[in-house]
């Protein structure tokens, strides 16, 4: 029997079979954020837990300085959830006075950075107006999709307001990617 | 040609190639819930349809008594959506009287249970304050991420209030997992 | 060495090994929608970008006329996010007049069409009441799950109101599927 027999008839020479268990994978979980400088019109990036609790990186997928480093070109499924929480926004105060206004908002962006290209690429965005009425509000934004990434690409999660991120539990705010 | 030729140079002996079609997988869909006893501070678990309509389990992934049973150690992508619906919460009534208050909330938790340890592990949580103004409200909470699971682990979906779960359609409320 | 050596002991004859890189995959992104006729009780389908920017189809997964065509039977993970935005709904105006009412809503449905079967199948639905108070509101609905599909099946994304879909950015509204 030849190894060929298990390969489908359209098997490409350039796409070798490989064990699923050795594919780059990561699931990162929230940690308390330290206030950092960021440009006025640029959303700050979150930093993450990469080795404690439910968090892990494996098979050459590494986390460093807010970035997930892509070790191998291919199609990746990338996902993140950020849970936000805050006090009633000004929106409701203004509204109570009978004046319509542009609502506050919360936004999550998963961004790709390629060293050879100066401008980051926004892969995924979840954005929601927040015009809550109760005195405390909280809600998650979830994102996930498949992208073709190149070896050396870096992924990060940016948010509109780092002070609204719920960092209390590893199951509420997280970020992950795996090679398909 | 030897079987070796399709294995990448970093192929591990302990990670054999395997057909994708024989990996454990399940997609479960909502059924009407029967009221069950649960401890005061413990969210009740949903039970699920596992074989009718869009629901299925395959390749030794089994569903029994509210739990998905993990038949093989590895990295799994786990997901769930729960659609909630309700009448206007007290929150808005109190608000109309001009008194601020802590909003009601809806929560979904995907939980892992390991027989060797009595305490469940919360893998994923989606939680949202609900302070709706219309007389009827409805909304989904979606969760999904990758976790390292062991053979024998059990997965369930817990919710903050089982009576608010929309069980009317299999496409609105569901739960699934598959080995990567 | 025989090719057999990398196949686990439960390898099925009917499930040949195959390279991950040649599996059908697609990620489609939003484009501006052209108003189209649709039946009164049927949600309109979105059309999509399939080759520019972040969008792609590969390995015989094709996009044509609002549909993703499934080229090979198997288990697929299917996902979509639709970001909606609108002006304050009538709901809040009526509410201000003190009359309770059924809230407006936004809905996304991922639908499967099988030529041999007359009735489309709703695979996934995300539906949310909208009773916003600020003058402009926006929010995403995300869906994703695994389904067993047959060669020749067609997938589309339907929405409750095409005029509320945010088509401005490819990272806000998207649709994808990949063979597991």
């Amino acid at each position: 029997l030849k190894g060929q027999e298990f390969a489908p008839s359209h098997q490409q020479v350039y796409a070798p079979l490989r064990a699923d268990g050795d594919k780059p994978r990561a699931h990162l979980t929230v940690v308390r954020q330290t206030p950092t400088q960021h440009f006025k019109n640029q959303f700050p990036a979150l930093h993450w837990e990469h080795e404690l609790g439910l968090a892990f990186t494996k098979n050459r997928m590494n986390y460093t300085n807010k970035f997930l480093l892509i070790p191998e070109s291919g199609d990746y499924f990338i996902y993140s959830q950020v849970t936000f929480r805050g006090m009633t926004s000004e929106c409701s105060e203004i509204r109570q006075a009978g004046r319509p206004n542009k609502p506050d908002s919360i936004t999550v962006v998963i961004t790709k950075v390629t060293d050879s290209y100066p401008e980051p690429t926004q892969l995924l965005m979840g954005t929601k107006s927040v015009c809550e009425v109760g005195s405390n509000w909280f809600q998650p934004i979830y994102l996930g999709a498949m992208f073709s990434l190149q070896e050396g690409d870096k992924l990060m999660v940016n948010v509109s307001d780092i002070s609204l991120v719920d960092y209390t539990k590893e199951d509420k705010t997280f970020f992950g990617a795996f090679l398909l | 040609l030897k079987g070796q030729e399709f294995a990448p140079s970093h192929q591990q002996v302990y990670a054999p190639l395997r057909a994708d079609g024989d990996k454990p997988r399940a997609h479960l869909t909502v059924v009407r819930q029967t009221p069950t006893q649960h401890f005061k501070n413990q969210f009740p678990a949903l039970h699920w349809e596992h074989e009718l309509g869009l629901a299925f389990t395959k390749n030794r992934m089994n569903y029994t008594n509210k739990f998905l049973l993990i038949p093989e150690s590895g990295d799994y992508f786990i997901y769930s959506q729960v659609t909630f619906r309700g009448m206007t919460s007290e929150c808005s009534e109190i608000r109309q009287a001009g008194r601020p208050n802590k909003p009601d909330s809806i929560t979904v938790v995907i939980t892992k249970v390991t027989d060797s340890y009595p305490e469940p592990t919360q893998l994923l949580m989606g939680t949202k304050s609900v302070c709706e103004v219309g007389s009827n409200w409805f909304q989904p909470i979606y969760l999904g991420a990758m976790f390292s699971l062991q053979e024998g682990d059990k997965l369930m979906v817990n919710v903050s209030d089982i009576s608010l779960v929309d069980y009317t359609k299999e496409d609105k409320t569901f739960f699934g997992a598959f080995l990567l | 060495l025989k090719g057999q050596e990398f196949a686990p002991s439960h390898q099925q004859v009917y499930a040949p090994l195959r390279a991950d890189g040649d599996k059908p995959r697609a990620h489609l992104t939003v484009v501006r929608q052209t108003p189209t006729q649709h039946f009164k009780n049927q949600f309109p389908a979105l059309h999509w970008e399939h080759e520019l920017g972040l969008a792609f189809t590969k390995n015989r997964m094709n996009y044509t006329n609002k549909f993703l065509l499934i080229p090979e039977s198997g288990d697929y993970f299917i996902y979509s996010q639709v970001t909606f935005r609108g002006m304050t709904s009538e709901c809040s105006e009526i509410r201000q007049a003190g009359r309770p009412n059924k809230p407006d809503s936004i809905t996304v449905v991922i639908t499967k069409v099988t030529d041999s079967y007359p009735e489309p199948t709703q695979l996934l639905m995300g539906t949310k009441s909208v009773c916003e108070v600020g003058s402009n509101w926006f929010q995403p609905i995300y869906l994703g799950a695994m389904f067993s599909l047959q060669e020749g099946d067609k997938l589309m994304v339907n929405v409750s109101d095409i005029s509320l879909v945010d088509y401005t950015k490819e990272d806000k509204t998207f649709f994808g599927a990949f063979l597991l």
Epitope: V31, R32, T34, E49, E51, L52, G53, L54, A55, F56, T57, K58, E170 | T114, S116, Y117, E119, T121, S148 | -
Partner: antibody
Framework: EVQLQQSGPELVKPGASMKISCKAS????????MNWVKQSHGKNLEWIGL????????NYNQKFKGKATLTVDKTSSTAYMELLSLTSEDSAVYYC????????????WGQGTLVTVSA | QIVLTQSPAIMSASPGEKVTMTCSAS?????MHWYQQKSGTSPKRWIY???KLASGVPTRFSGSGSGTSYSLTISSMEAEDAATYYC?????????FGGGTKLEIK
């Protein structure tokens, strides 16, 4: 009650290898990450490395790479540290110690295992 | 790696006296913890996350600091506080300990 029960003291010859065990009870073994710490002659504490029983992931202090190998057996809730090619410099008390999240610090410590390397 | 320097290395205090020891980091850290160790026993978590007292730690202990400078304070020294105190950072691997401050009772 949380307990980390380490194996007993060891007298080993230079060049030999040995394995210390640490059996955890009273908490979720896979919920906490196991660390190993060296204390020479009642002096400084040195972090050797960690292993996360949930994921199997390890992180070693560069200084101890090739000297220590960390493993776990989830079925018995036991962590192990193998020390290789021992020299007199490796004579010390070794502690296993578990942490939940990094803002918590090391919550639980074993009683320590005294390793003496001598001909 | 981040080097943690504790000072003083050794100090003594009379019962009722206020005691302060410091831990200086070579780079900024987010997560600083303190452990108490008495002779012949394992270290115990004493103060975590800069300022939180571990279970069973008397309220006369407090912790403070940020960035590269942290301290542990005892408002009123008692005999049972005589021990060695180690700081440890959990911000950057390897997760280093300070050299310890040995606190003796006069």
């Amino acid at each position: 009650e949380v307990q980390l029960q380490q194996s007993g003291p060891e007298l080993v010859k230079p060049g030999a290898s040995m394995k210390i065990s640490c059996k955890a009870s009273g908490y979720s073994f896979t919920g906490y990450t196991m660390n190993w710490v060296k204390q020479s002659h009642g002096k400084n504490l040195e972090w050797i490395g960690l292993i996360n029983p949930y994921s199997g992931g390890t992180n070693y202090n560069q200084k101890f790479k090739g000297k220590a190998t960390l493993t776990v057996d989830k079925t018995s809730s036991t962590a192990y540290m193998e020390l290789l090619s021992l020299t007199s410099e490796d004579s010390a008390v070794y502690y296993c110690a578990s942490i939940y999240q990094r803002h918590d610090g090391i919550a639980y410590w074993g009683q320590g295992t005294l390793v003496t390397v001598s001909a | 790696q981040i080097v943690l320097t504790q000072s003083p290395a050794i100090m003594s205090a009379s019962p009722g006296e206020k005691v302060t020891m410091t831990c200086s980091a070579s780079s900024s850290v987010n997560y600083m913890h303190w452990y108490q160790q008495k002779s012949g026993t394992s270290p115990k978590r004493w103060i975590y996350d800069t300022s939180k007292l571990a279970s069973g730690v008397p309220t006369r202990f407090s912790g403070s600091g940020s960035g590269t400078s942290y301290s542990l304070t005892i408002s009123s020294m008692e005999a049972e506080d005589a021990a060695t105190y180690y700081c440890q950072q959990w911000s950057s691997s390897p997760y280093t300990f300070g050299g310890g401050t040995k606190l003796e009772i006069k």
